[in-house]
């Protein structure tokens, strides 16, 4: 009987999670005489197979980062191997899992900031990439400062935009940074996927060296 997993040859779309060990058939196509067998073409990548009787399955785990959509065609053939139905498009959409960790483009960043710079104005960007789907939490990155060295009076002089990786001064940093007292700082920045919201997220860290330069602008005398 026809149902969710079997039926006639017609255009269809299936969604399958990547990384899953093949465990079940995708679909059983039913042949209408004179069709006696089926043929699969397209982006099979030697993963997708159709048996003569119309059983469509995959023989190893899919990888969305290799191919996010497999465009296949299935045709029904008669006893001479002549196409008598189709080919019809069969689309396999590969659903993302969190199987890639974010990585910073550089293991070390260097930048400089002038004392008294406007708070919130970016002077340096750190950037990480994640091969997972950015439209899902798996590929949504969250940046944060782990350590600031030196840390004076437990006050953070630097801040980071959690989404963009833009580093800027805090209000305190704008007011208190003084190259005569501390000409350089080091930040350890982390990036997490899953929007930083999950214990199962992957992370990476990078180091940022910041030079504080003197503000040479002097207020005009009255």
């Amino acid at each position: 009987q026809e149902g969710k997993f079997s039926g006639p040859l017609k255009p269809m779309t299936f969604s399958i999670y990547e990384g899953q060990e093949p465990s079940q058939i995708i679909f059983q196509f039913k042949a209408n005489p004179p069709a006696v067998t089926f043929e699969l073409t397209g982006e099979t990548d030697n993963i997708f197979v159709i048996e003569r009787e119309g059983l469509l399955y995959y023989n190893r785990a899919l990888d969305r980062e290799t191919r996010s959509t497999h465009n296949l065609q299935v045709a029904a053939l008669d006893a001479n191997g002549i196409i008598v139905e189709g080919p019809v498009p069969i689309t396999i959409k590969v659903k993302d899992i969190n199987d890639n960790r974010p990585t910073f483009l550089q293991s070390k960043y260097e930048g400089s900031v002038r004392q008294n710079s406007r708070p919130g104005k970016p002077f340096l960007y750190v950037n990480a990439t994640d091969l997972d789907d950015p439209a899902t939490p798996n590929g949504q990155l969250y940046y944060q400062i782990v350590i600031q060295l030196p840390m004076i009076n437990n006050v953070m002089y630097f801040q980071i935009n959690n989404k963009t990786g833009a580093i800027s001064l805090t209000r305190e940093g704008s007011q208190e940074l003084n190259p005569a007292k501390n000409p350089s700082y080091n930040l350890v920045i982390s990036v997490k996927d899953m929007g930083g919201q999950s214990e199962n997220s992957f992370s990476d860290t990078t180091s940022v060296d910041i030079i504080v330069t003197e503000n040479i602008w002097k207020a005009p005398k009255p």
Epitope: P33, P34, V36, L77, D78, A79, N80, G81, I82
Partner: antibody
Framework: QVQLQQSGAELARPGASVKMSCKAS????????MHWVKQRPGQGLEWIGY????????YYNQKFKDKATLTADKSSSTAYMQLSGLTSEDSTVYYC???????????WGAGTTVTVSS | EIVLTQSPPLMAASPGEKVTITCSVS???????LHWYQQKSETSPKPWIY???NLASGVPIRFSGSGSGTSYSLTISSMEAEDAATYYC?????????FGAGTKLELK
């Protein structure tokens, strides 16, 4: 070895019918399609149609749809072609040939000659 | 239906001569679906070349086939007396299966 043994020559009157046979040996009869081909003297080859002995499904060239009837008998590994409403145009040689899946006619019979005469 | 046009219809070649027979197909087909048969008088056709370029069992290696799309050919590198016969091309792409009208090759 693989062979297709066709029946002997047929002599028939106009309007009559003839039924010729093609006995297969040396292979599994139901694993291949059987085709019939017409060849008029000094002329080319014309494909009449085929039968799939496994399912008894047959398919005809439109030109021969009302002329030929293809059947098969699994028990004797024999394919048959009946020609009806015979005219002088049907006087010629008819071959059976084995069809190879996604392939070609890999084995041919020796042919059966049909003569239509009043 | 797919029409196959062979040329020349009739030709003569001397022993040792190179021979080329062509088969033009009315619409593009896969090369795996174009075949050649040899027929000598009073005998049934024999499979000669299948899938454009594959020689059937027992066919001498002086024969070769090539082509794609709508243009195919059979070549004999060096004509021999036993090659005198009629050669037919045939398509296995769609129904009805069709043959070319044949090329009769004679020995000069």
């Amino acid at each position: 070895q693989v062979q297709l043994q066709q029946s002997g020559a047929e002599l028939a009157r106009p309007g009559a019918s003839v039924k010729m046979s093609c006995k297969a040996s040396g292979y599994t009869f139901t694993s291949y399609t059987m085709h019939w081909v017409k060849q008029r003297p000094g002329q080319g080859l014309e494909w009449i149609g085929y039968i799939d002995p496994k399912s008894d499904y047959n398919y005809y060239n439109q030109k021969f749809k009302d002329k030929a009837t293809l059947t098969a008998d699994k028990s004797s590994s024999t394919a048959y072609m009946q020609l009806s409403g015979l005219t002088s145009e049907d006087s010629t040689v008819y071959y059976c040939a084995r069809g190879f899946f996604k392939g070609y006619f890999d084995v041919w019979g020796a042919g059966t000659t049909v003569t239509v005469s009043s | 239906e797919i029409v196959l046009t062979q040329s020349p219809p009739l030709m003569a070649a001397s022993p040792g001569e190179k021979v080329t027979i062509t088969c033009s197909v009315s619409s593009s087909i896969s090369s795996s679906n174009l075949h050649w048969y040899q027929q000598k008088s009073e005998t049934s056709p024999k499979p000669w070349i299948y899938g454009t370029s594959n020689l059937a069992s027992g066919v001498p290696i002086r024969f070769s086939g090539s082509g794609s799309g709508t243009s195919y050919s059979l070549t004999i590198s060096s004509m021999e007396a036993e090659d005198a016969a009629t050669y037919y091309c045939q398509q296995w792409t769609s129904y009805p299966f069709t043959f070319g009208a044949g090329t009769k090759l004679e020995l000069k």
